[in-house]
Amino acid sequence: SDKLYQRKEPVISSVHTKVKGIAEVTENVTEGGVTKLGHSIFDTADYTFPLQGNSFFVMTNYVKSEGQVQTLCPEYPRRGAQCSSDRRCKKGWMDPQSKGIQTGRCVPYDKTRKTCEVSAWCPTEEEKEAPRPALLRSAENFTVLIKNNIHFPGHNYTTRNILPTMNGSCTFHKTWDPQCSIFRLGDIFQEAGENFTEVAVQGGIMGIEIYWDCNLDSWSHHCRPRYSFRRLDDKNTDESFVPGYNFRYAKYYKENNVEKRTLIKAFGIRFDILVFGTGGKF
């Protein structure tokens, strides 16, 4: 409740997160008439990426382009990229939509289509749909520990969300355990009224709000966080206009002394932790 006599100041905060969980992934890669089923285990180092600020990312899906090498090859025949003669291809041209620099030659991409040859990481990335269901859909059961230290410098008061009495095996629940700072990812989505399985396919951005409403007067002292959750990305975005949340990264290796890479388009959930509130004292 707003106490008009109190001197209030905004919270200063730092956040640290730790994600835990193991996913077993079975992926189908079909090329050249062979569907290869691969079974792999993903641990924290495989699916989380360090982000700056109060954010963490959990990969829930991916598309791989394996065995790429820097050379010349036909570019992917996306809409408007096909050619019938060299006239259509400009040497040295870098189309922002393309994956390389054109050589000026129009070459066969497959039996029926020709595209401009490019100097690039080859074969160039295909425009593939994100797998459905998501490959790491079991990330729903991962947990995240959120450590939040706060400070009110004007009142010379510091505290944190984790109390010495807290049980390390607890899981946050709005009713049964609202002070537990270990959150199951699926529960975060449920609380926000979202379907994890669906969002996991293309990715998205989820907000974890930590609200501190602190009364620092000794006679009625109260300073504990309240957690709430809401989706931050626009889930109603037209499917054709960059839905979800994804980025690309590469794993580099050498094969027969040739540098190669596996390009990974990672889809996932970026969790933004938003800490706000005030501390009031007479």
């Epitope: 090329e31 050249g32 008439g33 062979v34 569907t35 290869k36 089923l37 079974h39 039996k111």
Partner: nanobody, 128 residues
Framework: EVQLVESGGGLVQTGGSLRLSCAAS????????IAWFRQAPGKEREGVSI???????FYADSVKDRFSITADGAKTTVFLQMNSLKPEDTAIYYC??????????????????????WGQGAQVTVSS
């Protein structure tokens, strides 16, 4: 019309080698993957090796490092070089064109994409 004709089968001693050939007509190896399957008396048919239409090779765990699948330059004939043969390699070997599944060292036909095209088979007998 798609046709596959195997040759090169025969009788060989344990530890010996054989080279099977599969002559393909009515299609090119750019259209399908080619695999070798085998069936021993009283046993289920098992996939041995695949050559994908983009040139990747796959082997069943039972033949890895002993068998090798290749194609000729014209991509009309596929070969299965079999070394260090064992009595348990005795079977009828079939050449198959189609779509396949490779799962942790096991090879099977991708029946969702059809039953493939099969040759008549070549007998391989390994005596001890």
């Amino acid at each position: 019309e798609v046709q596959l004709v195997e040759s090169g089968g025969g009788l060989v001693q344990t530890g010996g080698s054989l080279r099977l050939s599969c002559a393909a007509s009515g299609f090119t190896l750019d259209d399908y993957a080619i695999a070798w399957f085998r069936q021993a008396p009283g046993k289920e048919r098992e996939g041995v090796s695949i050559l994908s239409s983009i040139g990747k090779t796959f082997y069943a765990d039972s033949v890895k490092d002993r068998f090798s699948i290749t194609a000729d330059g014209a991509k009309t004939t596929v070969f299965l070089q079999m070394n260090s043969l064992k009595p348990e390699d005795t079977a009828i070997y079939y050449c198959v064109a189609g779509h396949f599944v490779y799962n942790d060292g096991a090879i099977s036909l991708n029946t969702a994409r059809g039953s493939g095209f099969w040759g008549q088979g070549a007998q391989v007998t390994v005596s001890s």
